[in-house]
């Protein structure tokens, strides 16, 4: 906390310019009206305020603001943005895209801080949903942005906001965060045709159902295994040989190197061994010939 | 972190020269802006210069004309050169930079050379 002392004569601050930096903590706290901080808040950033001073600025606007700064304010924070705490940055209301990709510039570069993480999700639950282009900046600052997300807060992404979505965007997420995203993507891609839409949606497969499965298979798609790996397992297993088979095309033969692996070990288990044998690729582990599979499943929901 | 050292002070008769040199270490490339303080015995310690990433700098008005702050973005290195000593330039001079890390600033500093203008 500065005391407060009275500005020395002809020191008292008539703009906020750069000769402001050669003042004492006390003298910037003296000698710079609050309200003319607020006004001339764009020059601020411009201006290498030392560490000590911008404690002095930001009490002033504290001072000033006590229930939150006005966005005409936090749009020109600058460095002042790291000197805010979570508790600082609840109480705003931010609306514009500007703003937040003005503060996100500051912290470039850098792990998300809880700081950021307020921000975004105060600025989230002010547009109501994360619409593309929020999503667009948000990624493109944050790549895992997406996978940090819950579910639930994901079920407020609109399907025309999946189009913002790269591949690296989704590299952290957990199925149950795929599982919400994929049925989005698939409504969003719905337009294109077969080759282009598996670009689009190859990202998202890991929440895809058995049918969707079978059904690209019959759209000549040759999945890669990389993404064969990241299916769900319970979508996988009701799949036939001949459905793997067309599913993968030439990547097939990359089911050896895989076969202690799930999904495809659990695959394995499923399927009887001589139609395993048709691959030619020595996969072993398939139930043998003369064997009957009793779908136990089935059973109980038939009693 | 950011580690500084300076280096350069001394004993100097008034109206002679010094050049202060601060070399940095560390995350280097998050600095933009640095900066030389100084503490005179006594007294609290004040800013005489400073220098930004783009190389734009300004010096305080009583050693304007006398004091000139560069840096050498190659070297890591910040430099104070001081002409025309008087004795009232004599404090030990500090170096200091923040940086952005983890979502909040950090301030870091040199441990001071003493600069003593005497004759």
């Known amino acids: 906390e500065v005391e407060k002392t009275a500005c020395p004569s002809g020191k008292k601050a008539r703009e906020i310019d750069e000769s402001l930096i050669f003042y004492k903590k006390w003298e910037l706290e003296a000698c710079v009206d609050a309200a003319l901080l607020a006004t001339q808040m764009d020059r601020v950033n411009a201006i290498p305020f030392t560490y000590e001073q911008l404690d002095v600025l930001k009490h002033k606007l504290d001072e000033l603001y006590p229930q939150g700064y006005p966005e005409s304010v936090i749009q020109h924070l600058g460095y002042l943005f790291l000197k805010m705490s979570p508790e600082d940055i609840r109480k705003w209301n931010v609306t514009s895209l500007e703003t937040l990709k003005a503060l996100l510039e500051v912290n470039k570069g850098h792990e998300m801080s809880p700081q950021v993480a307020t921000l975004i999700d105060r600025f989230v639950k002010g547009r109501g949903q994360l619409d593309k282009d929020t999503l667009d900046t948000l990624t493109a600052f944050y790549p895992g942005y997406l996978c940090s997300l819950s579910p639930e807060e994901l079920s407020s992404v609109p399907p025309s906001s999946i189009w913002a979505v790269r591949p690296q965007d989704l590299d952290t997420c957990d199925p149950r965060q795929l599982d919400v995203l994929y049925p989005k993507a698939r409504l969003a891609f719905q337009n294109m045709n077969g080759s282009e839409y598996f670009v689009k949606i190859q990202s998202f497969l890991g929440g895809a159902p058995t049918e969707d499965l079978k059904a690209l298979s019959q759209q000549n798609v040759s999945m890669d295994l990389a993404t064969f790996m990241k299916l769900r397992t319970d979508a996988v297993l009701p799949l036939t040989v001949a459905e793997v088979q067309k599913l993968l095309g030439p990547h097939v033969e990359g089911l050896k190197a895989e076969e202690r692996h799930r999904p495809v070990r659990d695959w394995i288990l499923r399927q009887r061994q001589d139609d395993l044998d048709t691959l030619g690729l020595g996969l072993q582990g398939g139930i043998p010939n003369g064997y009957l599979v009793l779908d136990l499943s089935m059973q109980e929901a038939l009693s | 972190e950011v580690q500084l050292v300076e280096s350069g002070g001394g004993l100097v008769q008034p109206g002679g020269s010094l050049r202060l040199s601060c070399a940095a270490s560390g995350s280097t490339s998050s600095i933009n802006t640095m900066y030389w303080y100084r503490q005179a015995p006594g007294k609290e310690r004040e800013l005489v210069a400073f220098?930004?990433?783009?190389?734009?700098?300004n010096v305080r008005d009583s050693v304007k004309g006398r004091f000139t702050i560069s840096r050498d973005n190659s070297k890591n290195t910040l430099y104070l050169q001081m002409n025309s000593l008087r004795a009232e330039d004599t404090a030990v001079y500090y170096c200091?930079?923040?940086?952005?890390?983890?979502?909040?600033?950090?301030?870091?500093w040199g441990q001071g050379t003493l600069v003593t203008v005497s004759s």
């Open positions: 220098i930004s990433s783009g190389g734009s700098t």
């Open positions: 200091n930079t923040y940086i952005p890390y983890g979502g909040t600033l950090h301030d870091f």
